[in-house]
Interface confidence: low
């Protein structure tokens, strides 16, 4: 066990030309925070892969307001380290994603607005217990300077935090074959003997006699890949031929948990413990958010329209997929409207338009809105070769030149009189009637005959607008 520590030194404009605009302004003050995501190994990770080694958010930095006319300086940073605890062995090789987030401090209902300013990623080799490693990474016009290290939590020591240290039993020196535990020179490396036969490649131990498995391996000696672990179920009678337990029918048979989730039985069914980034009954739903940096190839990540939707990647030209992971023939998306011919030039798309159409995507019908105006604040809507006006409230007709009469349809019931009003219409009800359209008779005893309770409200319910 141990902790990965990240110290951000500076975040500001890079050295090249074209300094970025300050992310904050007097009108919209903001502050920065950082997120680090760690994954084991050096291989390319799938877009959905969670931060399997862990993730951490920094505190918020000081509020920053741009000085008008001044270039974007190094921005004020949060205090302290970002710390990512790891429970098992430190893998030695890891991938990281460091994101710089902006928190706008306007008055948003439901909380402050967040947006991703910059995202850097890399793969590194790092031994636990070593000195701080310094790094500089650039993301567009921004530059991030930081240091990082991995340190073991006592009693673990070593480059993978898998050796244990114990206080010396004798004051002078350690026992035979045991070294002092730097930097804790008053402690000695503990004799650590894993369970006999524990796989040296796929197993490790933090206590003598145990055998703990690295991800993807299982079994008492960590010799069985997870996908072939059908003999490890404790249920059912032992099979004489295979020497393993033949599982009886059980809810976890075949591991119903997707995406690396682990299955445990419950009295009535099963429960999946999902890895970070997934959720759902069977870990089938990706719970990755923009904070996990899921958009590849320069895709822009935004939260979904609903706070419960995790993220949406807006892909740059040439890429598609929910994570912008697929390179596309952009013409297959048929971007040219109205029968235009698509040309993918690599650096850009061109549309060769048919006669009578124009625009980057042949979207303008030259017979539509060109040179036509809609009166009284109406807007022209193109399509079908004939222009149409969407008129402002109170106007109608082909060109919005006619004043609309909201009372023309006689909307007031029971002899109510209709008055046109800037916001629509108002009904003045005849005696004995009430309601927005005079639709309800007023009983002589003063009670009103309101309509039956709408579906979902029982009579007598307060009609809350919630």
């Amino acid at each position: 066990a141990g902790v990965f520590e990240l110290q951000i030194h500076s975040f500001g404009p890079g050295p090249g030309p074209g300094a970025p605009r300050s992310p904050c302004s007097a009108r919209l003050p903001c502050r920065l925070f950082f997120r680090v995501c760690l994954k084991p190994g050096l291989s390319e990770e799938a877009a959905e892969s969670p931060c399997a080694l862990g993730a951490a958010l920094s505190a918020r930095g000081p509020v920053y307001t741009e000085q008008p006319g001044a270039p974007a300086p190094d921005l004020p940073l949060p205090d302290g380290l970002l710390q990512v605890p790891f429970r098992d062995a430190w893998p030695g090789t890891f991938s990281f994603i460091i994101e710089t987030w902006r928190e706008e401090l306007g008055d948003q209902i439901g909380g402050p607005a967040w947006s991703l300013l910059a995202r850097v990623a890399g793969r590194r080799r790092l031994a636990a217990g070593g000195p701080w490693a310094r790094d500089i990474q650039r993301a567009g016009a921004w530059e991030l300077r930081f240091s990082y290290r991995a340190r073991c939590e006592p009693p673990a020591v070593g480059t993978a935090c898998t050796r244990l240290c114990r206080p010396r039993s004798a004051p002078s020196r350690c026992g035979p074959g045991l070294r002092p535990c730097a930097p804790l020179e008053d402690e000695c490396e503990a004799p650590l003997v894993c369970r006999a036969g524990c796989s040296p490649e796929h197993g490790f131990c933090e206590q003598p006699g145990e055998c703990r498995c690295l991800e993807g391996w299982t079994g008492p000696l960590c010799t069985v890949p997870v996908s072939t672990s059908s003999c490890l179920s404790p249920r059912g009678p032992s099979s004489a031929t295979t020497g393993c337990l033949v599982p009886g029918p059980g809810p976890c048979d075949g591991n119903p948990c997707a995406n690396g989730g682990s299955c445990s039985e419950t009295p009535r069914s099963f429960e999946c413990t999902c890895p970070r980034g997934f959720y759902g009954l069977r870990c089938e739903v990706s719970g990755v958010t923009c904070a996990d940096g899921p958009c590849f190839n320069g895709g822009l990540c935004v939260g979904g329209a609903d706070p419960d939707s995790a993220y949406i990647c807006h892909c740059p030209p040439g890429f598609q997929g929910s994570n912008c992971e697929k390179r596309v023939d952009r013409c297959s998306l048929q971007p040219c409207r109205n029968g235009g011919l698509c040309l993918d030039l690599g650096h850009a798309l061109r549309c060769r338009c048919r006669a009578g159409f124009a625009g980057p995507r042949c979207e303008h019908d030259l017979d539509d809105c060109a040179g036509r105006a809609c009166a009284n604040g109406g807007t022209c809507v193109e399509g079908g070769g004939a222009h149409r006006c969407s008129c402002a409230l109170g106007f109608g007709g082909r060109d919005c030149r006619e004043r609309a009469d909201p009372c023309a349809a006689r909307p007031c019931a029971h002899g109510g009189r209709c008055y046109a009003h800037f916001s629509g219409l108002v009904c003045a009800c005849a005696p004995g009637y009430m309601g927005a359209r005079c639709e309800f008779p007023v009983h002589p005893d003063g009670a009103s005959a309101l309509p039956a309770a709408p579906p979902g409200l029982r009579p007598g319910d307060p009609q809350r607008y919630l």
Epitope: F33, L57, A59, R60, I109, G110, G111, P112, Y279, V285, G287, T289, A291, G304, A305, D306, P307, D308, S309, A310, L466
Partner: antibody
Amino acid sequence: EVQLVESGGGLVQPKGSLKLSCAASGFTFNTYAMNWVRQAPGKGLEWVARIRIKSNNYATYYADSVKDRFTISRDDSQNMLYLQMNNLKTEDTAVYYCVRQGYSYDWGPWFAYWGQGTLVTVSA
Amino acid sequence: QIVLTQSPAIMSASPGEKVTITCSASSSVSYMHWFQQKPGTSPKLWIYSTSNLASGVPARFSGSGSGTSYSLTISRMEAEDAATYYCQQRSSYPPTFGGGTKLEIK
């Protein structure tokens, strides 16, 4: 296992005050936004208040019906959520539920895990 | 704020029968959540983000919909499904619940 146990309900007179508590266990309390939801006897559900986590400055939000009368707060060191209710009205009579958001760091369904509820009766 | 109207308010179904409960929103919402509540117990999250079943929910339940119209469907009604079901949105602040649909077993 996620556990939310409400307490502090009871009979109170109109314009009186009451403080509800919710003891949370089985999860890392300080990484989850929390809510109070109420249910009047025989009626539907109504969201009352919400409090976010420290990294969101413990921001609080209230239903219009309780604004300026109720105060939601939390004590992360004790894994406790509170609802201070002042100037109570008869229409505040309900079972009050302590409810945890689905996923840590302010993500997922707001009302994923519910306590058993505590009854508040406002009556003269 | 968005008003959610559930229909029907009360319904009964025979075992094995297909059941559909609808939830209509006064404005478009992006997702809908559903809760189940049995008498004397707390509500339980049943379906989240329109179509995802919460932990322990039988596969005979499903959710669908978009915009202003959402539904919860039980492919084959069972006695244990008798309960009140509420829809809930939080696409728009404040979060709101439907008035509930009481589902009884015939």
